[in-house]
C-alpha cells in the first residue's frame, strides 16, 4: 500500500459568542483538511478526532464518524468544526477578547487532529498538530492558511 497523506490546511472560520455574566468565550472553529489517497484502491475515512488546546489546556473536542470514502489516486477536502469554551480559570481571557481599543484579538491555539482510515480491513491513523491564530474578538472567515501561527509574540495575558 502507498501512503494516505493528511494535510491540515488551516482555520476556515471562527464564530465567537460570549456569556457576559460568566466571562466565558465560546468559539466555534471550523478547520479544513486535505486527505490524499495515493493508492490504486478506495479508502474509507472512518473518523476524525480533533481537539483544541489553549495554554496547554484542552478547550474543545470533536469527533466525526463515517465521513467519506476517497477513490483511487484522489483527494478530498474535509471541513470539521470544534466547539471550544474558554472559561473557569482561563476566563480572564475575556478581558482581552472584549477589549474594544484593539481591532484584532488574536490568540494562539494548538489544533490537533487524528484521521483514521480503513482499507481491506486494515486501519491506519495519521495525526497532525499545528499552532494557529484565531481572533476571539469577532466572527472571522479566513483565507486558507491565513491564520497560521508564525514565530511572533503571543498577546500578554
Amino acid at each position: 500500500p502507498r501512503s494516505i497523506d493528511v494535510k491540515y490546511i488551516g482555520v476556515k472560520s471562527a464564530y465567537v459568542s460570549y456569556d457576559v455574566q460568566k466571562r466565558t468565550i465560546y468559539l466555534n472553529i471550523t478547520n479544513t483538511l486535505n486527505i490524499t489517497n495515493n493508492n490504486y484502491y478506495s479508502v474509507e475515512v472512518e473518523n476524525i478526532t480533533a481537539q483544541v488546546q489553549f495554554a496547554k489546556t484542552v478547550i474543545g473536542k470533536a469527533r466525526l464518524n463515517n465521513i467519506t470514502h476517497i477513490g483511487p489516486l484522489d483527494m478530498k477536502q474535509i471541513d470539521y468544526t470544534v466547539p471550544t469554551v474558554i472559561a473557569e480559570e482561563m476566563s480572564y481571557m475575556y478581558d482581552f477578547c472584549t477589549l474594544i481599543s484593539i481591532k484584532v484579538h488574536n490568540i494562539v491555539l494548538m489544533m490537533q487532529v487524528t484521521v483514521t482510515t480503513t482499507y481491506f480491513g486494515h486501519s491506519e491513523q495519521i495525526s497532525q498538530e499545528r499552532y494557529q491564530y484565531v481572533d476571539c474578538g469577532r466572527n472571522t472567515t479566513y483565507q486558507l492558511g491565513q491564520s497560521e501561527y508564525l514565530n511572533v509574540l503571543q498577546p500578554q495575558q
Partner: antibody, heavy 123, light 111 residues
C-alpha cells in the same frame, strides 16, 4: 486631557422622563466602554449599565431594566441616559464614567468620571 | 448579586498615622491571578476618583501612600501616612460579574 462633561441639573415631575447627556473629549470615544452610576443623597453608589460605544451593546443591572436606557452618538462622542416613569426614588446624582483599561486587557474600573447630573423628582 | 461589606462605616485617624479600611465580598471576586476589586475616594460635591484597580494596582497620579491588598473575598485599603487632604469617603467596587456593586462606604476623618 480626558473630559466627561455632563448636562445640567433636572427638576422633573413624577411619571415624566428625562434624558441626560455625557459629552466626552480627549480620547477615542469608541475605544472605551462607558458606564452610568447612580448616587442617592447621602448614600452609596449603584452601577446602572455599561455600553460598548462601537456597536451599542449595553449590559444592564437588572434593577434598572425598564427604568434606564443607555444610548450613544458616535458622531458627537456623547453618551445618553434616558430615565422614564420617574418617582422620588429616582432622585439622585447620576454619573457617567469611562471604563479604564491596560494595554491588552480590560480592568472594569472607572478611571474618569463626569461631574454628575442631579435629577430631582418632585411635584 | 455580590454584596460588598465595608468596615468600619467611619473612622478617625490622626495625621501621619495609618488608616485601614476593609471590604469583604459575599463570594470570591478573583479569577486565576486576577482580582476584580477597585477602590475609590469621594469628597463632598465631587465625583468618585479611582485610587486602586485590580486589588493592588495604584492608579496613575495617585500618591504612593495609598495601597491595596487582598484576594478572594477579603480586601484592604491602607493609607499611610494619612494627610489632611485624605478626609473623604472611600468605596470598594467589584467587577467580577454583572451587576457590578459598591461597598457602603467608609468615611475617613482626620484628627
Amino acid at each position: 486631557e480626558v473630559r466627561l462633561q455632563q448636562s445640567g441639573p433636572e427638576l422633573v415631575k413624577p411619571g415624566a422622563s428625562v434624558k441626560i447627556s455625557c459629552k466626552t473629549s480627549g480620547y477615542t470615544f469608541t475605544d472605551y466602554y462607558m458606564n452610568w452610576v447612580k448616587q442617592s443623597h447621602g448614600k452609596s453608589l449603584e452601577w446602572i449599565v455599561n455600553i460598548n460605544p462601537n456597536n451599542g451593546d449595553a449590559f444592564y443591572n437588572q434593577k434598572f431594566k425598564g427604568k434606564a436606557t443607555l444610548t450613544v452618538d458616535k458622531s458627537s462622542n456623547t453618551a445618553y441616559l434616558d430615565l422614564r416613569s420617574l418617582t422620588s426614588e429616582d432622585s439622585a446624582v447620576y454619573y457617567c464614567a469611562r471604563e479604564g483599561q491596560l494595554r491588552l486587557r480590560r480592568v472594569y474600573a472607572m478611571d474618569y468620571w463626569g461631574q454628575g447630573t442631579s435629577v430631582t423628582v418632585s411635584s | 448579586d455580590i454584596v460588598l461589606a465595608q468596615s468600619p462605616a467611619s473612622l478617625a485617624v490622626s495625621l501621619g498615622q495609618r488608616a485601614t479600611i476593609s471590604c469583604r465580598a459575599s463570594k470570591s471576586v478573583s479569577i486565576s491571578v486576577y482580582t476584580y476589586v477597585h477602590w475609590y475616594q469621594q469628597k463632598p460635591g465631587q465625583p468618585p476618583k479611582l485610587l486602586i484597580y485590580l486589588a493592588s494596582n495604584l492608579e496613575s497620579g495617585v500618591p504612593a501612600r495609598f495601597s491595596g491588598s487582598g484576594s478572594g473575598t477579603d480586601f484592604t485599603l491602607n493609607i499611610h501616612p494619612v494627610e489632611e487632604e485624605d478626609a473623604a469617603t472611600y468605596y470598594c467596587q467589584h467587577s467580577r460579574e454583572l451587576p457590578y456593586t459598591f461597598g457602603g462606604g467608609t468615611k475617613l476623618e482626620i484628627k
